[in-house]
Amino acid sequence: MKVLQEPTCVSDYMSISTCEWKMNGPTNCSTELRLLYQLVFLLSEAHTCIPENNGGAGCVCHLLMDDVVSADNYTLDLWAGQQLLWKGSFKPSEHVKPRAPGNLTVHTNVSDTLLLTWSNPYPPDNYLYNHLTYAVNIWSENDPADFRIYNVTYLEPSLRIAASTLKSGISYRARVRAWAQCYNTTWSEWSPSTKWHNSYREPFEQHHHHHHHHHHH
């Protein structure tokens, strides 16, 4: 039994790090392998992660960790019974993949504006809480070409867009993901998408008399 692709890990900078690797053949990860991880200098015993299968020869392990401190460094030992297959280290702050935002909601009660809001996935005392920026993806279910990305570079987890920028009378979906420049993170996974019907109709009178003013909104 050998490791074909060495473990690579990402941290959510909160409580979970996820490590993935590939073996040289089909493996029952949970019964044959154990990933031991220990904070460097920690005097208590190493923690054990029981991996799950991730495809035939792939394994994935979710390492439960304490709050991350930027200097944290972990040793990783991959064991098959009494055989040490691989030894490495992992610094969570250098491999951050933020948690996905949640609770994405589209508020359509303001006649000419769509307000999208979502929740920051971190508690206020986590360093990433004030360092996330977002990308919002909106697309039409009817027209695959109608696909747009809005970059939200301010801290507030919300986006306002003019309803008139979307086609009227059709259904749209939206999703949001996050990243943090300070730790040069990867993007988070996308949030679950939410669907709404864009029923915005620009009244003829308003369009006629306030056309210029409308485009300044």
């Epitope: 200098f41 920690l42 005097l43 208590s44 304490d66 401190v69 200097a71």
Partner: antibody, heavy 119, light 108 residues
Framework: EVQLVESGGGLVQPGGSLKLSCAAS????????MSWVRQTPDKRLELVAT????????SYPDSVKGRFTISRDNAKNTLYLQMSSLKSEDTAMFYC????????????WGQGTSVTVSS | DIQMTQSPASLSASVGETVTITCRTS??????LAWYQQKQGKSPQFLVY???TLAEGVPSRFSGSGSGTQFSLNINSLQSEDFGSYYC??????????FGGGTKLEIK
């Protein structure tokens, strides 16, 4: 309930020896790092010895190095501190403490045992 | 060894007041700092770790903050059971970890 109970303290003459014990219960002793911390009469705290979960790694500050030895018996759930060549400045309350599972902070402390070094 | 400077050495306050105790380190310890409370005649009790995370069962009127070399422990709306001594301790790097000199919090 986590419990740490120290014993073995007492009055000893300068140059003498003493062995402290700490009986642990209420947790899986063999998975935790342990330490001895002393509190001097002026109420200062000093970490005097640490040991990792399997007993394979120990550490001491310069003030006690070569005179104090920390050890553990995981089968008996007991931590020890062997002290020799004792000096008057070793007079203190000695606490046994458990290291937190994720960090090297001490989450549980015993009630302490008093050591007085005097002629 | 890293030096820990705790201040003030003592302070008096009344029930209901807010107090702040500070701890300064001689070098960067990131957030590897713990706080302990010790009541008269008792052993120290674990309060805070990673500079800001409350230990299990610690009331929310306690809060820790800081990183690098400057840290503080805040106690909002002091209760009678909060009086005693407080100590900071760093656990950065190999085990040559040191404590601050302590702060004695007394009833005014």
């Amino acid at each position: 309930e986590v419990q740490l109970v120290e014993s073995g303290g007492g009055l000893v003459q300068p140059g003498g020896s003493l062995k402290l014990s700490c009986a642990a219960s209420g947790f899986t002793f063999s998975t935790y790092g342990m330490s001895w911390v002393r509190q001097t009469p002026d109420k200062r705290l000093e970490l005097v010895a640490t040991i990792n979960s399997n007993g394979g790694s120990t550490s001491y500050p310069d003030s006690v190095k070569g005179r104090f030895t920390i050890s553990r018996d995981n089968a008996k759930n007991t931590l020890y501190l062997q002290m020799s060549s004792l000096k008057s400045e070793d007079t203190a309350m000695f606490y046994c403490a458990r290291f937190f599972r994720f960090r090297n902070a001490m989450d549980y402390w015993g009630q302490g045992t008093s050591v007085t070094v005097s002629s | 060894d890293i030096q820990m400077t705790q201040s003030p050495a003592s302070l008096s306050a009344s029930v209901g007041e807010t107090v702040t105790i500070t701890c300064r380190t001689s070098e960067n310890i990131y957030s590897y700092l713990a706080w302990y409370q010790q009541k008269q005649g008792k052993s120290p009790q674990f309060l805070v770790y990673n500079a800001k995370t409350l230990a299990e069962g610690v009331p929310s009127r306690f809060s820790g903050s800081g990183s690098g070399t400057q840290f503080s422990l805040n106690i909002n709306s002091l209760q009678s059971e909060d009086f005693g001594s407080y100590y900071c301790q760093h656990y950065y790097g190999p085990p040559t970890w040191t404590f601050g000199g302590g702060t004695k919090l007394e009833i005014k």
